[in-house]
Interface confidence: low
């Protein structure tokens, strides 16, 4: 019989608000009080096995004791009522768990979406954490009909998908109730026609067709989602070239009502474009569909839009009456080639004489010409047609080039090597820029580019390396032939020299020494040598440093001590730092020449 609890605690399963006060009462049973010879004075309250101070107890009568908590801060409290029996032994009477938390806040930001082909889903902001099991119920009704409640699942408490089919063009009222053990609150009601909450499926079967007539257009066709039957659609159509990462967009006003095709204009010829499309209700009420799967197409070819860059080189060793000329040109970039290049056509006309035609697949042509003046033309051909012609005058052998560019400068900027000049007063047809790496080990292999006659500043469009010395030549080209070339050296990026200068003595006297050194080879300079520093010291003395201009190759150290061993080394400096050469030692003689001890 005594397995029966000795009493009970009221309330049995309390749920209380955090930071509120709470009182529990323990009531002892008569039979227990008789058995253990106790009354309410013998009750000891404990929380989580720790005894509660007596100041929090109240003896209500001989059978009942209460305990009061102020500002409950724990979410879960194990509260036990115990009695002190014979010999101060504790006997548990009853235990409860006090759960604490917060009442629900009014749900906010209720919004609904009808994903096409699915039932309506609403979501909301449930407010602060309550620490209690809180049930959210989505309620909905027509003016004349209540729909079944939608109870949010525990793992997704702030959204719910209704169980009924969506009816468009009839307003529905929707709200959310939040309820837990501490209270119940209702969100604001929202009233809407579900047609304004539609998220269509994306258009599908997107395909791209090109046009032989126009190389600047591509026609898109697609299948609209079934929701087209319910709403008028508008579209976003985006496109990009295959290698681009950013999308361009068709002006939305051009795609503002239901359609299943669209012609995109102003595209580049022979270019692969990627397209995607999405749709939504035309008045902008609702949600954009996801993007369709991407589809790509290539615009039709067009004739090359530009003549290639065109230049020539003459072999300096020429036979009597003839010279070997190499005509060179650049491949057009894809956006100017506008198609697959088939071949190049070169014509050479001896001044006021006969014309020779050449069809070439390469980007150079070597010909033997007389010493006369020639006119060369170059066109490039693809499937659609030929480019305009590039025209070049190859002057006669005795031609004297004049009128160079002035104030030629070259400088690095933004990881590119820029060249600028002052234009000559005469009318320039174009400029040819040639550049090569200066090296003691290898010949200067030239790359080149062409610029319009209006240009006076450009950057070198090649794969340039850092810490290499580039010899850059700019030649203006006039109607009657090339002008005088002007050259300049430049670095894309300087570095300290790879080696320092090797110093040696040219002449050593009792109190002075003439040092000499060679200019550093260009391959190890890594930049413009701005100055040298000579460091010299005796074994026991301090080091002395002397700065020397970079144009010098010798220097005289004076005020030296006779009969002394000197250590000397030399550093060369570019704009990016210096490098020491090897150390060299010499000894000054005890006596000057002709001097006797």
């Amino acid at each position: 019989e005594l397995l029966d609890p000795c009493g009970y605690i009221s309330p049995e399963s309390p749920v209380v608000q955090l930071h509120s006060n709470f009182t529990a009462v323990c009531v002892l049973k008569e039979k227990c009080m008789d058995y253990f010879h106790v009354n309410a004075n013998y009750i000891v309250w404990k929380t989580n096995h720790f005894t509660i101070p007596k100041e929090q107890y109240t003896i209500i009568n001989r059978t009942a004791s209460s305990v009061t908590f102020t500002d409950i801060a724990s979410l879960n409290i194990q509260l036990t009522c115990n009695i002190l029996t014979f010999g101060q032994l504790e006997q548990n009477v009853y235990g409860i768990t006090i759960i604490s938390g917060l009442p629900p806040e009014k749900p906010k930001n209720l919004s609904c979406i009808v994903n096409e082909g699915k039932k309506m889903r609403c979501e909301w902001d449930g407010g602060r954490e309550t620490h209690l099991e809180t049930n959210f119920t989505l309620k909905s009704e027509w003016a004349t009909h209540k729909f079944a409640d939608c109870k949010a699942k525990r793992d997704t408490p702030t959204s719910c998908t209704v169980d009924y089919s969506t009816v468009y063009f009839v307003n529905i009222e929707v709200w959310v109730e939040a309820e837990n053990a501490l209270g119940k609150v209702t969100s604001d009601h929202i009233n809407f026609d579900p047609v304004y909450k539609v998220k269509p499926n994306p258009p599908h079967n997107l395909s791209v067709i090109n046009s032989e007539e126009l190389s600047s257009i591509l026609k898109l066709t697609w299948t609209n989602p079934s929701i087209k039957s319910v709403i008028i659609l508008k579209y976003n159509i985006q496109y990009r070239t295959k290698d681009a990462s950013t999308w361009s967009q068709i002006p939305p006003e051009d795609t503002a009502s239901t359609r299943s095709s669209f012609t995109v204009q102003d595209l580049k010829p022979f270019t692969e474009y990627v397209f995607r499309i999405r749709c939504m209700k035309e008045d902008g009420k609702g949600y954009w569909s996801d993007w369709s799967e991407e589809a790509s197409g290539i615009t039709y070819e067009d004739r090359p839009s530009k003549a290639p860059s065109f230049w020539y080189k003459i072999d300096p060793s020429h036979t009597q009456g003839y010279r070997t000329v190499q005509l060179v040109w650049k491949t057009l970039p894809p956006f100017e080639a506008n198609g697959k290049i088939l071949d190049y056509e070169v014509t050479l006309t001896r001044w006021k004489s006969h014309l020779q035609n050449y069809t070439v697949n390469a980007t150079k042509l070597t010909v033997n010409l007389t010493n006369d003046r020639y006119l060369a033309t170059l066109t490039v051909r693809n499937l659609v047609g030929k480019s305009d012609a590039a025209v070049l005058t190859i002057p006669a052998c005795d031609f004297q080039a004049t009128h160079p560019v002035m104030d030629l400068k070259a400088f690095p900027k933004d990881n590119m090597l820029w060249v600028e000049w002052t234009t000559p007063r005469e009318s320039v047809k174009k400029y040819i820029l040639e550049w090569c790496v200066l090296s003691d080990k290898a010949p200067c292999i030239t790359d080149w580019q062409q610029e319009d006659g209006t240009v006076h500043r450009t950057y070198l469009r090649g794969n340039l390396a850092e810490s290499k010395c580039y010899l850059i030549t700019v030649t203006p080209v006039y109607a009657d032939g090339p002008g005088s070339p002007e050259s300049i050296k430049a670095y894309l990026k300087q570095a300290p020299p790879s080696k320092g200068p090797t110093v040696r003595t040219k002449k050593v006297g009792k109190n002075e020494a003439v040092l000499e050194w060679d200019q550093l080879p260009v391959d190890v300079q890594n930049g413009f040598i701005r100055n040298y520093t000579i460091f010299y010291r005796t074994i026991i003395g301090n080091e002395t440093a002397v700065n020397v201009d970079s144009s010098h190759t010798e220097y005289t150290l004076s005020s030296l001590t006779s009969d002394t061993l000197y250590m000397v080394r030399m550093a060369a400096y570019t704009d990016e730092g210096g490098k020491d050469g090897p150390e060299f030692t010499f000894t000054t003689p005890k006596f000057a020449q002709g001097e006797i001890e």
């Epitope: 009808v114 063009f169 609209n224 087209k228 039957s229 008028i232 009502s257 239901t258 359609r259």
Partner: antibody, heavy 129, light 108 residues
Framework: EVQLVQSGAEVKKPGESLKISCKGS????????IDWVRQMPGKGLEWMGI????????RYSPSFQGQVTMSVDKSISTAYLQWSSLKASDTAIYYC??????????????????????WGQGTTVTVSS | DIQMTQSPSSLSASVGDRVTITCRAS??????LNWYQQKPGKAPKLLIY???SLQSGVPSRFSGSGSGTDFTLTISSLQPEDFATYYC??????????FGQGTRLEIK
């Protein structure tokens, strides 16, 4: 003003072919379904089928499947109803009507809701030998 | 197919009368029912959609009610221009859309 204008009355012999038209104006023609409805002399209304002008999606009533063909030319906002071989029993007034967009969505199916809010004036077809 | 049955097939009434026409569906069609009015030699005209919604421009003396299988069109006070044939039409299950056989309303 939203309107549907149908082609004029036709008198034909059995076995002949026929194509009648219905031209929409005053609204986005490609965005609304077009219904075709038959009314035989002194009788009630019979629904023949429906076509969506933008992509020519067509649904026929089982009673008219294979008997008629519905088509559209969206470039001129016109819907057509045609017969390849007329019968005397095809004598009737044929109406086109704009199907006001109303639909119930249930899973992946759609149920047409509202009704035919704009009607053509009707085309009388008489088939007699 | 869903069958629509109208009653009566015809009825006579006077100007100012309250008139009720009923339409029964062979199975539940929820509220997917429309009412049309057709005058001789003219195309039908939509009066009521979704069982009880009044089409724009239709006088308020016309009203519709019902859901499931039983529907009613009521004209609260008959006017001379209301004498015509009335059709109910379901669009719950398509194809096909089906019409009732019509109710002819004549002047008494």
């Amino acid at each position: 003003e939203v309107q549907l204008v149908q082609s004029g009355a036709e008198v034909k012999k059995p076995g002949e072919s026929l194509k009648i038209s219905c031209k929409g104006s005053g609204y986005s023609f490609t965005s609304y379904w077009i219904d075709w409805v038959r009314q035989m002399p002194g009788k009630g209304l019979e629904w023949m089928g429906i076509i969506y002008p933008d992509d020519s999606d067509t649904r026929y009533s089982p009673s008219f499947q294979g008997q008629v063909t519905m088509s559209v030319d969206k470039s001129i906002s016109t819907a057509y109803l045609q017969w390849s071989s007329l019968k005397a029993s095809d004598t009737a007034i044929y109406y086109c009507a704009r199907h006001e967009r109303g639909i119930v969505e249930a899973g992946t199916d759609y149920y047409y809701y509202y009704g035919m809010d704009v009607w053509g004036q009707g085309t009388t077809v008489t088939v007699s030998s | 197919d869903i069958q629509m049955t109208q009653s009566p097939s015809s009825l006579s009434a006077s100007v100012g009368d309250r008139v009720t026409i009923t339409c029964r569906a062979s199975q539940s069609i929820s509220s997917y029912l429309n009412w049309y009015q057709q005058k001789p030699g003219k195309a039908p005209k939509l009066l009521i959609y979704a069982a009880s919604s009044l089409q724009s421009g239709v006088p308020s003396r016309f009203s519709g009610s019902g859901s499931g299988t039983d529907f009613t069109l009521t004209i609260s006070s008959l006017q001379p221009e209301d004498f015509a044939t009335y059709y109910c039409q379901q669009s719950y299950s398509t194809p096909p859309i089906t019409f009732g056989q019509g109710t002819r309303l004549e002047i008494k």
